[in-house]
Structures are given as C-alpha cells and as structure tokens.
C-alpha cells in the first residue's frame, strides 16, 4: 500500500465561501479553525499558491484559561478592487506538527460589465494615409464583442459582425473620432473617446531653384492637407560641417537651425543671409489648420562661392632702380571662398595697364626694364577666388627707396610678354 | 486515510503513447497539487511537472514539455501523465506524489514502472 | 531554474561511524512569507518509494529516529546521521520545492 496512512482529521471548522462580483469590488474571505495549544499562524492559498502579499488578519480567541487548552483562530483576507487576477480557488493553509492541512475551497469569480484592455488612442495621421486603431476588451462573462464608432456613427449594423481588436482606416480627408462599444451578457462598456487629427503629408520634392553665395531658391511639392487648406510652410537651414553628417532620417538638427516662414502658395522660398560657399541641410514642413506635417528629411545643399569682398590690405610699394617692391596683406573683408591668389595691375603715366597672376604670394619684386624712367608709377592689387576677383585696391603709387629701408629679397617671376617690365628667375 | 494508487507496470512498443494514472483518495483532490516524479533504473529522481486538480493549473520541467502532458478527471480523483513518441530512454519508474507546500507529510505512490521494448 | 548539488555522490562507513553529507542550491530558499526554508531530505531504499526524512532543512518527520539530522541556512545544506546503522543502507537525496520542484543527484550511503 502507498506510504502514508495518518489519518487527516481538519482542524477547519469554517472554510472560505464564494465571491463573485464586478470589477472593484471589495469583500473578504474567511475561515476559522479550532486546535489544541499554540495556535498557528494561518497562511492563504490562491489556486494552490501562498500569497507572498495577501492583505489578511489573524485573530485568536483562547477556549480556556491554560495554554493547552482549545483556541478559535480566524484568519480574514480582505479583497480590494476586486480585479481578473483575484479570480480563482482560496482555501486557508496550516502547518500543526508534523501535519499540512489546507480548508476547503472558496472561489472568487469576476462577473460584470465588459473591461477594457485597450482604448483607442488620440494620434494625428497624414492626409488620405491608412493607419489601424485597437481596441481590446474582457469579461466574464464571455464572449465579448465589440462595435466601432467613427463619429458616433456605428461601422456595422451589430456588434460583433464588423472589426473587432483592429480597425483598418483607409485614409481620412478631416479630423475625426473613433470609439468602439463593448457587448456582454451583462451590458454595454463604452472606450474613451480617440481623436484622429489630420495633419497634412509630408511636402515632396524638395529642390533648388537657383543659389546665390548667400541665398538660396528653393521650391517643394506640397502633399494633400485633406479639407484644411495649408496657412504657411517653415523652412529650416542648417550649417553643416563636412564632419556633422545630419542623417536622412535624423529627427533634429545638431544646432539650432535658421527658420524661414513661407506663404503658400507659391511653393517656394528665398532664404538669405547664408554664408557664402558653406554646406547646409534644409527641410521644410506645411501647416494647416489641424497643425504641421511631419518634416522632409534633410536635403544637402551649398552656397556657391563669392569673390572677395574687399581689396588687400596695407599695401606698400617702393621703387629702387629699375627694381620695384611691392607687399601687401589678405583682405580683412570675407573671402567667400577658397583664395585662390592676387592679380596685381601696374600702370605708368604714358604706359598701357599690365596684368599679372601673383599667385597666392603677398609680396613681389618687379625688375624694371630700361633706366627705370617711367614716371608716376602706380599698382593695383585684387584677390580672387573661384568666383572671380573681388575688388581692386586704389592705386599705389611707387615710392623712391630711401636708405635704411629694408630691402627684401623674394624670388622674381619673369613675364616675357610685359613690354615695361620682366619677372627674371633668380 | 491519504493513498495513492498507482498500477504496477506497463509495457508498451517505441513509437506508441501510454497514459499512466494515480487515483487519490482520503483527502480533497481539488486542493492538493498533483506531482510525478521520473527514476531510471540505477539514477537519481528527475521531477516531471505538477498540477493542481481543481483548476488544471500545470508547471512543467522543460525537459519534459514535449514529451508528458499532465491531465486530471476530478470526479474520479484521478490523475494522468500522457507520453508521447516513446523511446528506450522513456523506460523507468514514474512516481505520482501529493505536495505538501513543503510541509508534512508527504504521500508516494509505489510508483508504476514503464517499459518501452518491441 | 534553482540547481541543487549533492556531494559526495557515495560514501561507505561502518557502522556505528558517523556521517554528514552535503547539499547545494544556487539561491536561497528562504520564503519570506511563511519563514520557512523550502529544503527536504529524503531517503530511498532499493525497490522502495522514497520517504521524508527532514523538511523545513531541520524538522526531523514524524516517526524518524533521532539519529537523523537536517542543518544549515541560505543556500548551504547538510543531512547528519550520527551513528549509523545497517539499515541506513540507501541513497540520500534533497530536495528544493521553494520553486516547484528540483532533486539533488544523491548521495549513496554503503555500510562497510
């Protein structure tokens, strides 16, 4: 025969009885037990479990005036909000010497008005752009079946015979609501209320019209904005180092950006005060009444280069024989662009103007063919950049060489077809 | 008086399935968790899985999922362990035990001993 | 899942000797709720069921001679036979049921 043969007589004289309620409830279960000496403390089981956090009370009631004598011991669990997961078999369990007695079972069972597990959600949406909303709800009792609304218009003639935890909306041209109805045995549970805002698409094609080095044109394809007409579209540019690299999909630029409103239409805006032969990234988003679309992703784009805004600086020319000395600095107005070098122009009284490309060296010397006897000498310097030259110094005229002056020695540049002067390699 | 009754010996071909039984008795089926217990001849004991007769509440070893379902009629205070697909390795004695939420004490039944041969 | 280790795998002593054998879990199996340590000892005889010997990692069974002795807290366990006798002859296993259930691999005990 099996091991085991104690005979089990229970020490409960009161087990736990049956609740069943709606969501929230509060009740309480109870069981009561008599034994002899030390009463034990008294834990609960839930569906065979001991609850580690069971919100219950323990009262002991002495039978007699010794301790071996009989105690009542009654434990109560207090059940608050009564919830799906408090649903299922109770009993109270007992460890008295070598015996583990459990009471009979009590049950706890939910029955009510349909629960939601989920609610339509508020969003905003694009324009005519299909999207999906959820709803989910629960008994007891079952089934449950569910009825969408869109505008407190029902999308089926019955619950339960359209779509049920997904709705599949195609698209929508105005802001709308949605809500779904939950059907039971016991009633009808009503979702909050979602609000489906219609924002307009996200604007397409964003291009340059023409570029300027220090604005830019440029032009976009706005998307649908459904029965709200678009109010204004913002533009944004954003310096972009060679490094940055704001990716396609990046939700916000690095620093903060240069904003530009637009009225629509046209679909197009000048954007200004840019630095010259500098990358950005634009996009741009369109608003209507219900709000903004969703931002383009960044577009690359750069300003061209300019020529120089202002002429070299502290040019000094000085005349010693049939040599002339000639130096200056780089322009202290903006470049917009890469320097490229300085033209310099040279000019006697009676004499044609002579060009010359000096390169991106800042001094020269000139060996002057002849005796030197051209009169009034004068030079012009400009810098340039890819752009062209930017503008010419005012004209220079060559001083004599006086003693004590530094004379510097730079390598001379001969121009065989300058009729006044050469550039001798030394 | 608690007991647990277990058939003495099954034999059964590879391939086939078997549903091995434990009738309770002297005490509320429904409120005591239903163990099984695995022992290979000359090994250890591997415990199999669990339930709890009044809801069909199941717990099993992951080693055993796909191999033993775990079932139990009440009215009959009867509990079940199904296998399926069985092999060699399926040969040893199962044992069915009451739990006891790890008090005393504790009930065994002698245990039903499997054979998979053709 | 909670692994429980027993060692040695076997031993032999004659009798009378004393003997203590060692169990392992890989976390503690202390319930809060009832104050209890969920470790039992159990021993199997050839051809027989096992039977409890010690549960609550001390609390010798009911009808278990006094010889038999459970220890130890956390995770660190040990069953002590004080003087062993021939009918000891069996292997020892424990057992966690803080989380469901897991057996040690058992101890074997021979009489010299």
């Known amino acids: 025969a099996p091991r085991g043969t104690q005979a089990e007589e229970s020490p409960f004289v009161g087990n736990p009885g049956n609740i069943t309620g709606a969501r929230g409830l509060t009740g309480t279960l109870r069981c009561q037990l008599q034994v002899q000496g030390e009463p034990p403390e008294v834990h609960w089981l839930r569906d065979g479990q001991i609850l580690e956090l069971a919100d219950s009370t323990q009262t002991q009631v002495p039978l007699g005036e010794d301790e071996q004598d009989d105690w009542i011991v009654v434990s109560q669990l207090r059940i608050t909000s009564l919830q799906l997961s408090d649903t299922g078999q109770y009993q109270c369990l007992v460890f008295l010497g070598h015996q583990t007695f459990v009471s009979q079972p009590g049950y706890v069972g939910l029955e009510g008005l349909p629960y939601f597990l989920e609610e339509p959600e508020d969003r905003t949406v694009a324009a005519n752009t299909p999207f999906n909303l959820s709803c989910q709800a629960q008994g007891p009792p079952e089934p449950v079946d569910l009825l969408w609304l869109q505008d407190a218009v029902p999308l089926a003639t019955a619950p339960g015979h359209g779509p049920q935890r997904s709705l599949h909306v195609p698209g929508l041209n105005k802001t709308s609501s949605f809500s779904c109805e939950a059907h039971n045995a016991k009633g009808v549970t009503t979702s909050r209320t979602a609000t489906i805002t219609v924002l307009p698409q996200q604007p397409r094609n964003l291009h340059l019209v023409s570029r300027q080095p220090t604005e830019l044109e440029v032009a976009w394809t706005p998307g649908l904005s459904g029965i709200y007409p678009l109010t204004h579209c913002t533009l944004q540019a954003v310096l972009s180092d060679d490094g940055m690299g704001i990716q396609a999909g990046e939700p916000d630029p690095p620093e903060e950006p240069l904003t530009s409103q637009a009225s629509v239409p046209p679909h197009q805006l000048r954007l200004g005060s840019l630095h010259p032969h500098t990358p950005y990234h634009i996009r741009v988003a369109c608003t209507s009444s219900q709000g903004p679309s969703s931002w383009t992703h960044w577009l690359p784009v750069e300003t061209p280069e300019g020529v120089p805004l202002g002429p070299p600086e502290n040019i000094s020319a000085t005349r010693n024989g049939s040599q002339a000395f000639v130096h200056w600095q780089e322009p202290r107005a903006p470049l917009q662009g890469t320097l490229l070098g300085y033209r310099l122009a040279y000019q006697g009284q009676d004499t044609p103007e002579v060009l010359m490309d000096i390169g991106l060296r800042q001094e020269v010397t000139l060996e002057l063919q002849g005796d030197g006897s051209v009169s009034n000498l004068t030079v012009c310097v400009a810098a340039y950049t890819a752009a062209g030259d930017g503008p010419w110094s005012l004209p220079v005229p060559l001083e004599a060489w006086r003693p004590g002056q530094a004379q510097p020695v730079h390598q001379l540049v001969k121009e065989p077809s300058t009729p006044a002067f050469s550039w001798p390699w030394w | 008086q608690v007991q647990l009754q277990q058939p003495g010996a099954e034999l059964v071909k590879p391939g086939a399935s078997v549903k091995l039984s434990c009738k309770a008795s002297g005490y509320t089926f429904t409120s005591y968790w239903i163990n099984w217990v695995k022992q290979r001849p000359g090994q250890g004991l591997e415990w199999i899985g669990n339930?709890?007769?009044?809801?069909?509440?199941?717990n099993y070893n992951e080693k055993f999922k796909s191999k033993a379902t775990l079932t139990v009629d009440k009215s009959s205070t009867t509990a079940y362990i199904q296998f399926s697909s069985l092999t060699s390795e399926d040969s040893a004695v199962y044992y069915c035990?009451?739990?006891?939420?790890?008090?005393?004490?504790?009930?065994w039944g002698q245990g039903t001993t499997l054979t998979v041969s053709s | 899942d909670i692994v429980m280790s027993q060692s040695p795998s076997s031993l032999a002593v004659s009798a009378g000797e004393k003997v203590t054998m060692s169990c392992k879990s890989s976390q503690s199996l202390l319930n809060s709720r009832t104050r209890k340590i969920y470790l039992a000892w159990y021993q199997q005889k050839p051809g027989q069921s096992p039977k409890l010997l010690i549960y609550w990692a001390s609390t010798r069974q009911s009808g278990v001679p006094d010889r038999f002795t459970g220890s130890g807290s956390g995770t660190d366990f040990t069953l002590t036979i004080s003087s062993v006798q021939a009918e000891d002859l069996a292997v020892y296993y424990c057992?966690?049921?803080?989380?469901?259930?897991?057996f040690g691999g058992g101890t074997k005990l021979e009489i010299k």
């Open positions: 339930i709890y007769p009044d809801s069909s509440s199941t």
């Open positions: 057992k966690q049921s803080y989380n469901l259930w897991t």
């Open positions: 035990t009451r739990d006891t939420y790890g008090g005393s004490p504790d009930y």
